[in-house]
């Protein structure tokens, strides 16, 4: 079997949902010593980067300016050390937003409910679309999908304090082209004091995994690594 290097990690910097005409940044984290990184889009080569100096950098950033529906889709990356290529990263779905129109999000019976009540969100968009998406702020990976000609409903069932938070919806023209986001709807779920005090509220900052953790190796890091390796050998 052909030998390959471990697969790199691909991430979107800040978010995978990019407003049209704005810039997307994708990070490919591979290995120190990688001489070339390649970004692939829908199976075809999209961009190449050769880090300098390769032994000091463990990944690269790929910049995608002027985001549009032609650049929205599935991305992956690979890297090369010498003549040896890595396995392909997992796929990352890059979505273009702010296409066409803005939907309206409402909630029934209302934005303030009691724990155990049944809640349904309604997302409405008059322009031709059949798929709607509901996202909770701070949890943008947990996308709920629903279908309807002009309006879709998102039944939440009996809610708990864990459902508290801010929600937005999108109309989707295909999997990777979404409308403008709706205005947010804040769901407030009250429960008994015991539940309320224990229920963690969701963070409102962007998803913590949507950050690029690329590092530049310094001489000191190298010395520490060498020292650690020597110490491990002495301990054996």
């Amino acid at each position: 079997p052909k030998q390959t290097l471990p697969k790199p990690i691909i991430r979107a910097e800040s978010t995978y949902m990019v407003p049209k005409e704005k810039q997307a940044t994708l990070c490919c984290q591979g290995s120190y010593g990688a001489v070339e990184y390649q970004l692939h889009f829908e199976g075809s080569l999209f961009a190449v980067e050769r880090p300098k100096p390769p032994e000091r950098i463990n990944g690269v950033k790929f910049h995608i300016p002027d985001m549009n529906s032609r650049k929205a889709g599935r991305y992956s990356c690979i890297y090369r050390v010498g003549e040896l290529w890595s396995e392909r990263s997992d796929l990352l779905d890059l979505v273009v937003t702010e296409m066409y129109d803005t939907p309206t999000l409402s909630v029934h019976p209302g934005p303030e409910v009691t724990s155990g009540e049944k809640v349904t969100f309604y997302c409405r968009l008059d322009t031709a679309t059949s798929m709607f998406l509901l996202l909770k702020e701070g949890r943008s990976r947990d996308v709920q999908r629903s279908y309807g000609k002009v309006q879709a409903e998102f039944p939440m069932g009996p809610v708990t304090t864990a459902h508290r938070g801010s929600y937005r919806c999108f109309g989707s023209y295909n999997n990777y082209a979404w409308s403008f986001p709706s205005e947010p709807v804040k769901l407030l779920v009250t429960g008994d004091i015991e539940n309320t005090s224990l229920a963690p509220t969701d963070p409102t900052f962007p998803d913590s995994w949507d950050t690029c953790l690329l590092t530049r190796e310094t001489g000191l890091q190298k010395d520490l690594a060498l020292w650690d390796h020597t110490a491990q050998n002495l301990l054996r």
Epitope: F46, V48, E49, K52, H63, P65, R70
Partner: nanobody
Framework: EVQLVESGGSLRLSCAAS????????MGWFRQAPGKEREFVAA???????YYADSVKGRFTISRDNAKNTVYLQMSSLRAEDTAVYYC????????????????????WGQGTLVTVKP
């Protein structure tokens, strides 16, 4: 514009860009042969890193002159199958040293020049 050249001959294409963002642009050359899809030829990053299609590697050279806002494609050992309309393109703005290979990455395009290689 039409360029006629003998098989085995050489030719240099140039593409001048307007505006002062040229130095921060990544540039590329693409070509489209009659009845075929547009294909990638060569690209150059802001820092002069280059990438070539396998079909032109060793025969074509891409370069840029930021002072003249111009990108060049030096073509040698030309073959009949190199006959196509050649387009220059730019990705503006870019950061870092990305070399762009996919046509979807490019947001500015030249009008094209026909290169005919006589067998």
């Amino acid at each position: 514009e039409v360029q006629l050249v003998e098989s085995g001959g050489s030719l240099r294409l140039s593409c001048a860009a307007s505006g002062r963002t040229f130095a921060s642009a990544a540039m590329g050359w693409f070509r489209q042969a009659p009845g075929k899809e547009r294909e990638f030829v060569a690209a150059i990053s802001r820092s002069d890193d280059t990438y070539y299609a396998d079909s032109v590697k060793g025969r074509f050279t891409i370069s840029r002159d930021n002072a003249k806002n111009t990108v060049y494609l030096q073509m040698s050992s030309l073959r009949a199958e190199d006959t196509a309309v050649y387009y220059c393109a730019a990705v503006v703005p870019t950061y870092g040293n990305n070399i762009y290979v996919h046509s979807a990455a490019y947001n500015y395009w030249g009008q094209g020049t026909l290169v005919t290689v006589k067998p």
